[in-house]
C-alpha cells in the first residue's frame, strides 16, 4: 500500500573537524521510495557537487572533506507524492583544532619600552592562549599580560624579561605550540664609572678609568681635546656585560679627556659620555731647578742631533728622567704641524738641545741653556712660518702657554752668547751663514727682534732626521 514518507532517524547536530568526513543520516520509511533533497542554509545542494556524496537513495549525505565554510544548518526533505513532504534539520558545527595563524617572531626591544609578541589563533571551540617562558608557564602580572587576541604584551621591558618564549593554543580538540622565539632586551649604553680629573706634575703617568655597561656590550673610545687619542695605551676587559677601559697617559700637556661608550640598536646608536680634565701643576723650568744629574745621552730620538757621548742634564723631578725626557721630545715634535724640510732639522736640533740640555758637571750638576741667537735663528729663519702657526694656536687657546714653552723655548728669555759665551750652548748642527740665506724662503715675520749673528759653521754640514719620528 502507498505510504507517506516518515523520517525515522531525524537529523542530529554533527561535529566535524576541518578536512574530515561529515555524514548526515536522514532515514526515511515510505512507499514508493521517496525523492530526498538536501539543503544547506536553505540553499539546495546540487547532487553532482563532487564535495558531497549521496548514499542509500539520498538518505545519507556525506561531506567528503569539511571546510570552515560548510558550517550551517542542513535539512533533508523527503517526498514520494503520497501525503506531504517531510523535513528534518540538523547543524554542522565545524570544529577546528587550534591553529596558530600568526606566530610570534624574534624581538629585540630596548629596556623600558613596550614589547608585543603576537600569537593569533584559530579554532572551534575558540582556543585559550597561554605562554611559556623557558620551560615554565609564564605568570601574568602588572607588566605582563596575555591580550584577548592571544598576543603577549610586556610593559616597561626589563632585562630579566629576555629569554625564549612560545605560545600555546588549547581547546577541547587539541593543543598547538608555536615555535620558540627569542626576546632580546637591549639596554642603552651607560657609564658606571666615569674617569676622574687629575692635577699632576709634568711628565707624570696617569691612568684614566672608564666603566660602561649596556646590551649589546658597548665599545669605549677615548677623545682628547675633541680628537681621537693619539698617544697612550688603552687596556680593555669585558665581564658580565660590563666593559672596563683604562687609558694610560704620559702627561706633557693639559687636556680634556672624554670616555664615550657606544652600542648599536638596529640602525641606531646610543652613546654615553663622561669627561675628565688633566691639568699640570706649575712646573719649574729645568734651568732654574738644578735637581738632576749629568749623564751620557742614551736615547734614540736625538741621536743624530746631540754630539756623540754628549753629557746631558737629566731632571730628577721625573720618576724616570731619561724616559720622560725622551717621550717629551717625541711629543713636542708631534705638536709641530706643517713642517718644511728646511725647518725640520733646525727644529729637531733646537728641541733636542732644549729638552736634553748640555750638562755642566760639578758639585751641583747644572743645565746649560741654548744661546738666544741660535733660538732666534730657528724661530725667525728656519721655522718662521711654523712658529707663527704655533703662536696663533697659543693665542686661540689650543695650547696652554706653559705647555707651549715646554715644547719650544722662549728665545727672549735665553742668555745671549754675547753676555757670557760659556753661559749658553750653541747648536753645532745649525750650519748657517749669510751666504745660505738666499736658500730660505722670504721672511714672513717682521724684522727680527735682534740681530741674528753669523752663526759659526759646524763641521757637520748635513742634517739627519731619524725616520722613526716626524714633526707632523
Amino acid at each position: 500500500l502507498p505510504k507517506a514518507p516518515v523520517i525515522t532517524t531525524p537529523l542530529e547536530t554533527v561535529d566535524a573537524l576541518v578536512e574530515e568526513v561529515a555524514t548526515f543520516m536522514c532515514a526515511v520509511e515510505s512507499y514508493p521510495q521517496p525523492e530526498i533533497s538536501w539543503t544547506r542554509n536553505k540553499i539546495l545542494i546540487k547532487l553532482f557537487d563532487t564535495r558531497y556524496s549521496i548514499r542509500e537513495n539520498g538518505q545519507l549525505l556525506t561531506i567528503l572533506s569539511v571546510e570552515d565554510s560548510d558550517d550551517g544548518i542542513y535539512c533533508c526533505t523527503a517526498n514520494n507524492g503520497v501525503g506531504g513532504a517531510v523535513e528534518s534539520c540538523g547543524a554542522l558545527q565545524v570544529k577546528m583544532k587550534p591553529k596558530i595563524t600568526r606566530p610570534p617572531i624574534n624581538v629585540k626591544i630596548i629596556e623600558g619600552l613596550k614589547a608585543v609578541l603576537p600569537c593569533t589563533t584559530m579554532g572551534n571551540p575558540k582556543p585559550s592562549v597561554s605562554w611559556i617562558k623557558g620551560d615554565s608557564p609564564l605568570r601574568e602580572n602588572s607588566r605582563i599580560a596575555v591580550l584577548e587576541s592571544g598576543s603577549l604584551r610586556i610593559h616597561n621591558v626589563q632585562k630579566e624579561d629576555a629569554g625564549q618564549y612560545r605560545c600555546v593554543a588549547k581547546n577541547s580538540l587539541g593543543t598547538a605550540y608555536s615555535k620558540v622565539v627569542k626576546l632580546e632586551v637591549e639596554v642603552f649604553a651607560r657609564i658606571l664609572r666615569a674617569p676622574e680629573s687629575h692635577n699632576v706634575t709634568f711628565g707624570s703617568f696617569v691612568t684614566l678609568h672608564c666603566t660602561a655597561t649596556g646590551i649589546p656590550v658597548p665599545t669605549i673610545t677615548w677623545i682628547e681635546n675633541g680628537n681621537a687619542v693619539s698617544s697612550g695605551s688603552i687596556q680593555e676587559s669585558v665581564k658580565d656585560r660590563v666593559i672596563d677601559s683604562r687609558l694610560q697617559l704620559f702627561i706633557t700637556k693639559p687636556g680634556l679627556y672624554t670616555c664615550i661608550a657606544t652600542n648599536k640598536h638596529g640602525e641606531k646608536f646610543s652613546t654615553a659620555k663622561a669627561a675628565a680634565t688633566i691639568s699640570i701643576a706649575e712646573w719649574s723650568k729645568p734651568q732654574k731647578d738644578n735637581k738632576g744629574y749629568c749623564a751620557q745621552y742614551r736615547g734614540e730620538v736625538c741621536n743624530a742631533v746631540l754630539a756623540k757621548d754628549a753629557l746631558v742634564f737629566l731632571n730628577t723631578s721625573y720618576a724616570d728622567p731619561e724616559e720622560a725626557q725622551e717621550l717629551l721630545v717625541h711629543t713636542a715634535w708631534n705638536e709641530l704641524k706643517v713642517v718644511s724640510p728646511v725647518c725640520r732639522p733646525a727644529a729637531e736640533a733646537l728641541l733636542c738641545n732644549h729638552i736634553f740640555q748640555e750638562c755642566s758637571p760639578g758639585v751641583v750638576p747644572t743645565p746649560i741653556p741654548i744661546c738666544r741667537e741660535y733660538c732666534l735663528a730657528v724661530k725667525e729663519l728656519f721655522c718662521a712660518k711654523e712658529w707663527l702657526v704655533m703662536e696663533e694656536k697659543t693665542h686661540r687657546g689650543l695650547y696652554r702657554s706653559e705647555m707651549h714653552l715646554l715644547s719650544v723655548p722662549e728665545c727672549s728669555k735665553l742668555p745671549s752668547m754675547h753676555w757670557d759665551p760659556t753661559a749658553c750652548a750653541r747648536l753645532p748642527h745649525l750650519d748657517y751663514n749669510k751666504e745660505n740665506l738666499k736658500t730660505f724662503p722670504p721672511m714672513t715675520s717682521s724684522k727680527p727682534s735682534v740681530d741674528i749673528p753669523n752663526l759659526p759653521s759646524s763641521s757637520s754640514s748635513s742634517f739627519s732626521v731619524s725616520p722613526t719620528y716626524s714633526m707632523t
Partner: antibody
Amino acid sequence: EVQLVESGGGLVKPGESLRLSCAASGFNFSTYTMHWVRQAPGKGLEWVSSISSRSAYKYYADSVKGRFTISRDIAKNSLYLQMNSLRAEDTAVYYCARDFFQLGPPRFDSWGQGTLVTVSS
Amino acid sequence: DIQMTQSPSSLSASIGDRVTISCRASQRISSFLNWYQQKPGKPPNLLIYGASNLQSGVPSRFSGSGSGTDFTLTITSLQPEDYAIYYCQQSYSPMYTFGQGTSLEIK
C-alpha cells in the same frame, strides 16, 4: 533467502583484464547499494568499490581508482567489476556484498562465497 | 580516508573467558561502526551494526559499545565456535574501511 554468487575469477598475467560478476537473488536487487570487497591471501578485508541502487553514485578505493569499473544490470540482477591493468597486488578473493540500510547505519548484511583472482606472470 | 585501528592484533583466550577487542577510528564516526566475524575459507559474517546493535541470529554473548572514535566488541563467555578473526568497519564515509583484524585463538 538472500543469495550472492561471484564468478569470473581466475589466473591472469600482470597488465591483463578480467571481469567479475555477482548474481543476486532472494531480494529486490534494484533497491540496494552493492559493494565489492577483497581479501589477499592471509590478509585482512579491503573495501574495493560500491554502486548505488540506481547506479548514480560509484565509489572506489584509491588503490584501484582508474583501473577498475563497477556496474550493475537491474534486469539481470547482476553486479560487475571490470578489472583492467591488473597487478600482482590485486591477487585476492573478491566478495560481493549487499549494503543494508535500515534502523542504523549502512552495513554489509549478506556476502557471497568469493571468487579467487590470481595475477602472476 | 578514515583509518581504523584494531587492538590487539591477536589474542589467546580460553572457553568461558570474557574477551574484549578495541577499534579506534582516525576521526569521529558517530556510531557508524560494524563488527564482522570471519572463519577460515568463509566470507565475513555481520555481528554488530551501528556500534551496539546485535544483528539478528547472532548470539547475545556478543555486544558492542562506543561512539565517536573508540569502540569495543565484547564476548562475555567464549565458546569454541567463536575462535575466528574479527573485523571492525566504518560506514560513515562512502569509502568504507576495515580494521586490520584481530585473530582470536584457543589458549
